[in-house]
Interface confidence: medium
């Protein structure tokens, strides 16, 4: 009981929910559930029955492997899916798959909050703006990654002349996609173009 597998996929893709092991031999019944109690499909006596649900027309069951194919998944399909198998002995066995559907991240826009000469160095404060998403940020100065301490939506740093970069890139990523935004400065410390 309680085999839990995590899956993360991009919205709009086709997904196969399956287990890594073989199904019990000559099982009597196989049912896929969505959020514990909503049946999606049930196989019984050599035929599949698809239930009225938001998946109707988007799912297909392979009784041989137990795999459930879902087409064009959306964020609303985030859930724990349960495959329950009734063995010939009358015992039940179940497998759980936690599906996370993520939208591809949008292209970020870099906003220059502040840029100024400071003690012959260059003070920079840049923000990486994207619509409210849970993402990871990585900043690069001329392709050199900044340290982990700086990996959030705002890059705030004071650069010495030997560390100046011409272009600064913010890479936003989640587990299914990644996009970059770049801003370039005229050395040593003025805006060039976006």
């Amino acid at each position: 009981q309680g085999h839990l597998v995590h899956m993360t996929v991009v919205s709009g893709s086709n997904v196969t929910l399956n287990i890594s092991e073989s199904l019990p031999e000559n099982y009597k019944q196989l049912t896929w559930f969505y959020t514990f109690d909503q049946k999606i499909v049930e196989w019984d006596s050599r035929k599949s029955k698809y239930f009225e649900s938001k998946f109707k027309g988007r799912v297909r069951l392979d009784p041989q492997s137990g795999a459930l194919y879902i087409s064009k998944v959306q964020k609303e399909d985030n859930s724990t899916y349960i495959m329950r198998v009734l063995k010939k002995t009358g015992n039940e066995q179940e497998w759980k798959i936690k599906l996370q559907v993520l939208d591809p991240v949008p292209k970020p826009v870099i906003k220059i909050e502040k840029i100024e000469d400071m003690d012959d160095n260059c003070y920079l404060k840049l923000s990486c703006v994207i619509p409210g998403e849970s993402v990871n940020y990585t900043w690069y100065g001329d392709k050199r990654p900044f340290p982990k301490e700086l990996q959030n939506s705002v890059l705030e740093t004071t650069l010495m002349p030997h560390n100046y970069s011409r272009c600064y890139t913010c890479q936003v990523s989640n587990s299914v996609s990644s996009k970059n935004g770049t801003v370039c400065l005229s050395p040593p410390c003025t805006l060039a173009r976006s």
Partner: antibody, heavy 118, light 108 residues
């Protein structure tokens, strides 16, 4: 000339608290990340904590997380380290240091000694 | 975290000698983000080298750094009396910043 002067060290009992200060001069304090690094007697250097120039971001070594708080007052050009639930292993000279491009530490203050003992 | 191991632990030398200190990282230090510091008794550390090989402002040219990946070296071409101290390497390629345990250069 860049100068960093630490103060606030002393003898404290285990479980006690202490606040260290670092007065900065000779540079635009609010534009630079600052850090605390410590050195136990006769031992090597250990990074403790970091704060961004604006004070908006802070980071801690696992050994002090939840017990130490770094903060700064840019109007007073001063960096602080508030330490609570002190342990014997926190005994060290505590240095404040200016971060150069979030990379290396340059320069350092002269240090202030913290002794945790019953 | 990246562990830095310095060797030897102590070196006993005479003024005028050439010194080579080693710093080995447990994993590759990205883009040679390695610094060397000098610390004399009762004093704060002082930056000598950054970026594995660039001398900090005001550091005499008898100090030089080299290396990349996991192996780095600090060389003092000719020891002066004021060079007897403890030397630390520090990586800043990944968080947390870590230091080596130090090498003591003492007078023979």
């Amino acid at each position: 000339e860049v100068q960093l002067v630490e103060s606030g060290g002393g003898l404290v009992h285990p479980g006690g608290s202490l606040r260290l200060s670092c007065a900065a001069s000779g540079f635009t304090f609010g534009g630079y990340a600052m850090s605390w690094v410590r050195q136990a007697p006769g031992k090597g250097l250990e990074w403790v904590s970091l704060i961004s120039g604006s004070g908006g971001s802070t980071y801690y070594a696992d050994s002090v997380k939840g017990r130490f708080t770094i903060f700064r007052d840019n109007s007073k050009n001063t960096l602080y380290l508030q330490m609570i639930s002190l342990r014997a292993e926190d005994s060290a000279v505590y240095y404040c240091a200016k971060y150069s491009n979030y990379d290396y530490f340059d320069p350092w203050g002269q240090g202030t000694l913290v002794t945790v003992s019953s | 975290e990246i562990v830095l191991t310095q060797s030897p632990g102590t070196l006993s030398l005479s003024p005028g000698e050439r010194v080579t200190l080693s710093c080995r990282a447990s994993q590759s230090v990205s883009s040679s983000y390695l610094a060397w510091y000098q610390q004399k008794p009762g004093q704060a550390p002082r930056l000598l080298i950054y970026g594995a090989s660039s001398r900090a402002t005001g550091i005499p040219d008898r100090f030089s750094g080299s290396g990349s990946g996991t192996d780095f070296t600090l060389t003092i071409s000719r020891l002066e009396p004021e060079d007897f101290a403890v030397y630390y390497c520090q990586q800043y390629g990944s968080s947390p910043r870590t230091f080596g345990q130090g090498t003591k250069v003492e007078i023979k």
